[in-house]
Interface confidence: low
Amino acid sequence: EVEKTACPSGKKAREIDESLIFYKKWELEACVDAALLATQMDRVNAIPFTYEQLDVLKHKLDELYPQGYPESVIQHLGYLFLKMSPEDIRKWNVTSLETLKALLEVNKGHEMSPQVATLIDRFVKGRGQLDKDTLDTLTAFYPGYLCSLSPEELSSVPPSSIWAVRPQDLDTCDPRQLDVLYPKARLAFQNMNGSEYFVKIQSFLGGAPTEDLKALSQQNVSMDLATFMKLRTDAVLPLTVAEVQKLLGPHVEGLKAEERHRPVRDWILRQRQDDLDTLGLGLQGGIPNGYLVLDLSMQEALS
């Protein structure tokens, strides 16, 4: 704690400038008026204060705004933001996307810190949902942001925001997250024509149900094997050999290399061997000809 001492004669700060870097901590505390600091926060970034000096400046702002800083100050915090704790940030009401961008810029190049996570949380809660501009901004700074959200949190993403999502933003999403995002993507891209639609929806297909995969198989989409392998096993199982052949197009040959892996392995077990033989790929493990299949239901234990 910096002790309260009188400001030496002639040292009272009239503005925030470079001369302050030569002030000792106690001099900054005594000679810089908190209200002056608040109105000239934009200058702090241009001055190479030490971390100890920044601690003093933060302390002054905390005293001036014990209930939380106003947005006019927050927007210009610059690298003083790195001194803020999640507890500090929880007191803020950040509504401007420009403020969010300014603070994310300070942390650019680093992985998401607890401060940034709290800031984003406050911002999104303040807006009520993850709108397109916000999502665009967040994924630009943190490509994995979307996949860091729980399925419950993703439910607040409006379909319109899905336009901002790039394939790499979904790289680390698990099936539960894609289950939530896929219907939104389907809604967002519903008015696109076949080939354009497939390009956009492809990254989300890990959440697609069987009926949608059947529909895609009628559209000559030529799905690649990497996408096929990410589909939900329970969605792939009911597809016929003809439907999978149409879905994959020329990529159907890739099934052979994946025949031991899910979902291909489980799908093979559900097909008649005669039907599999029509592919000419040497896929084995189907239901022998003449067998009566009484129950094709399979319980999937997917977490």
């Epitope: 992985e111 998401m112 810190s113 607890p114 996570a117 860091s148 729980s150 419950e152 680390t172 892996h261 899910r262 234990a301 997917l302 977490s303």
Partner: antibody, heavy 117, light 110 residues
Framework: EVQLVESGGGLVKPGGSLRLSCAAS????????MNWVRQAPGKCLEWVSS????????HYADSVKGRFTISRDNAKNSLNLQMNSLRAEDTAVYYC??????????WGQGTLVTVSS | QSALTQPASVSGSPGQSITISCTGS?????????VSWYQQHPGKAPKLMIS???NRPSGVSDRFSGSKSGNTASLTISGLQAEDEADYYC??????????FGCGTKLTVL
């Protein structure tokens, strides 16, 4: 550099309680799921419990369910394991480990818990 | 949840290759490509050597490789070196959102 440091181990009588902590540094703790794994002297590794980055998902091994409670404080970069109704078979070195996709990519050095009368 | 099955020990001479198997069930190893392998030297914490069946984290020698067939995963170490002598554990994520480990394989470099 990523660091995980466990503490809180020691000798405790059967039926007693202990609280283990794991202090994390060098990475954004709040972005990662964390696990506790234990290893009885000269024995196998045994997974104990996991907690997701925002504490939304918590799981326990059957052997500790109802007795152990995992928690985390993202603001303090700490992971905790509250162990109640301890038994002799809980004697082990307890490790905290970070989950990176499918593997536990960083482990602490462990803290020894001995349950004995 | 039963432990994954590993051989208690394997051995090999320097320069040779060895393979350690890890057998689980359709609820773990067979269900997910989420098998990982750890190396543990006496008195030390385990170290991740392979994740997602065959992915090597940065800093791990390319002499270590992983594969999987059905319910069995394998770790292969080629060009054995003295410092490879350690215990090796496999692990898998399971369909009940838990993790399961093998009981370890002691590798002796002759």
């Amino acid at each position: 550099e990523v660091q995980l440091v466990e503490s809180g181990g020691g000798l405790v009588k059967p039926g007693g309680s202990l609280r283990l902590s794991c202090a994390a540094s060098g990475f954004t703790f709040s972005s990662y799921s964390m696990n506790w794994v234990r290893q009885a002297p000269g024995k196998c590794l045994e997974w104990v419990s996991s907690i997701s980055s925002r504490s939304s998902y918590i799981h326990y091994a059957d052997s500790v369910k109802g007795r152990f409670t995992i928690s985390r404080d993202n603001a303090k970069n700490s992971l905790n394991l509250q162990m109640n109704s301890l038994r002799a078979e809980d004697t082990a070195v307890y490790y905290c480990a970070r989950v990176q996709r499918a593997g536990l990519d960083y482990w602490g050095q462990g803290t020894l818990v001995t349950v004995s009368s | 949840q039963s432990a994954l099955t590993q051989p208690a020990s394997v051995s090999g001479s320097p320069g040779q290759s060895i393979t350690i198997s890890c057998t689980g069930s359709s609820s773990d190893v067979g269900n997910y490509n989420l098998v990982s392998w750890y190396q543990q030297h006496p008195g030390k914490a385990p170290k991740l050597m392979i994740s997602e069946v065959s992915n090597r984290p940065s800093g791990v020698s390319d002499r270590f490789s992983g594969s999987k067939s059905g319910n069995t995963a394998s770790l292969t170490i080629s060009g054995l070196q003295a410092e490879d002598e350690a215990d090796y554990y496999c692990s898998s994520y399971t369909s009940s959102s838990t993790w399961v480990f093998g009981c370890g394989t002691k590798l002796t470099v002759l």
